[in-house]
Amino acid sequence: EVEKTACPSGKKAREIDESLIFYKKWELEACVDAALLATQMDRVNAIPFTYEQLDVLKHKLDELYPQGYPESVIQHLGYLFLKMSPEDIRKWNVTSLETLKALLEVNKGHEMSPQVATLIDRFVKGRGQLDKDTLDTLTAFYPGYLCSLSPEELSSVPPSSIWAVRPQDLDTCDPRQLDVLYPKARLAFQNMNGSEYFVKIQSFLGGAPTEDLKALSQQNVSMDLATFMKLRTDAVLPLTVAEVQKLLGPHVEGLKAEERHRPVRDWILRQRQDDLDTLGLGLQGGIPNGYLVLDLSMQEALS
């Protein structure tokens, strides 16, 4: 806490300029009017203040706006934003996408800080849902943003926003998240033709059920192995050898290299060896000829 001292004669700041870097902490406190600082916040980012001086400037704004800064000030915080605590940010009401962009720009190239996470949370809650423009902005700055949300939070993403999602935005999503996103993507892209649809839906397929994979296998999509390996195991297991062959097209040869990894390994164990042999890939571990396969899960369901 900086002591309240009178401003020395002739040192009262008329504007926020570089002369202030020569002021001691107490002089800044005494000689810079908080209202002047608020109206000229944009100048702070072009002046080489010390960290200590920035702490004083922040303190002045905190005193002027104890209930939280107005958006006109927030938008021009620049690197002073990095001095804010999540508690400070929780007092803000940020509604403009331009303000959000300005503050994200300050932290660009670095992982999401607690300040940024709080800011985004406040912004999205204020909007009520993750609209397309917001999602566009957030994923541009933080490609992994979508996958940092819980399935519950993802449920508020409208299907129209899915158009903003790029494949790399889903890289770190787990199956639970893709389970939520896939139906939205299916809805968003439903009016596209076969090949275009597959290009768009491909990165969401980790949430696809068996029946959708079966449908895709009838459309000559030539799914690559990387996508296949991300499919839900429970969705892949019921697929027949013929369906997987159609689904992968020329990429079917890649199954050999993945035969020890899920979901390929588990799928092989469920196929007849005779059927696997038709692929000519030397896949081993299928059900030997003459063996009867009982679907115990079906039996349990009936009883």
Epitope: T50, Y51, D55, L82, S85
Partner: antibody, heavy 119, light 107 residues
Framework: QVQLVESGGGVVQPGRSLRLSCAAS????????MNWVRQAPGKGLEWVAV????????YYADSVKGRFTISRDNSKNTLYLQMNSLRAEDTAVYYC????????????WGQGTLVTVSS | DIQMTQSPSTLSASVGDRVTITCRAS??????LAWYQQKPGKAPKLLIY???SLESGVPSRFSGSGSGTEFTLTISNLQPDDFATFYC?????????FGQGTKVEIK
């Protein structure tokens, strides 16, 4: 006068960890940000990380993100660099350096401590 | 990330020469550029900050200029003590990037 003295360097095997320290004196340590900069043998300078005065803001070069952690103890006037999962390419002289603000250069440097990652 | 490119990488000169080293930033950094001098086995030493401001105690034969993306360091009357490697560096709120260095050696 300002003095920065690094310690903790040495020879370490790939995959192992090491912690460097930098003892500061001659200025108000808690007022300024501290950086680590490294220099591989015969190569140029590479900025590694910075920690702001109060310790909550930390930023890293992409080459060390997720492996190195910068920290400070303002009560002891000491800066640290925890280096995990070390690689041969981390072999370098590590310098600590001070900056006084977000738009300030590195005005004081220590003499450096050598870290060699080798099996 | 902002990339800094220095040229030349090596410069041969004689005592008394005027030497110029160039530094180019991959995007505008306003005037937030510093120049450092480093001698073998020693820590770097700050010469110039904010593109053209001379650090206290640095001889006036060193000068810097430029803004935006193009910067130069000039040594007007090269002295025996000036043979060293020089680095430019951009600095902003949370990161610093160095140029690859320019070695000034005796011709």
């Amino acid at each position: 006068q300002v003095q920065l003295v690094e310690s903790g360097g040495g020879v370490v095997q790939p995959g192992r960890s090491l912690r460097l320290s930098c003892a500061a004196s001659g200025f108000t340590f808690s007022s300024d940000a501290m950086n680590w900069v490294r220099q591989a043998p015969g190569k140029g300078l590479e900025w590694v990380a910075v920690i702001w005065n109060e310790g909550s803001n930390k930023y890293y070069a992409d080459s060390v993100k997720g492996r190195f952690t910068i920290s400070r103890d303002n009560s002891k006037n000491t800066l640290y660099l925890q280096m995990n999962s070390l690689r041969a390419e981390d072999t370098a002289v590590y310098y600590c350096a001070r900056d006084r603000g977000p738009l300030w250069p590195l005005d004081y440097w220590g003499q450096g401590t050598l870290v060699t990652v080798s099996s | 990330d902002i990339q800094m490119t220095q040229s030349p990488s090596t410069l041969s000169a004689s005592v008394g020469d005027r030497v110029t080293i160039t530094c180019r930033a991959s995007q505008s950094i306003s005037r937030w550029l510093a120049w450092y001098q480093q001698k073998p086995g020693k820590a770097p030493k700050l010469l110039i900050y904010k593109a053209s401001s001379l650090e206290s105690g640095v001889p006036s034969r060193f000068s810097g200029s430029g803004s935006g993306t193009e910067f130069t360091l000039t040594i007007s009357n090269l002295q025996p003590d000036d043979f060293a490697t020089f680095y430019c560096q951009q600095y902003n709120a949370y990161s610093r990037t160095f140029g690859q260095g320019t070695k000034v050696e005796i011709k």
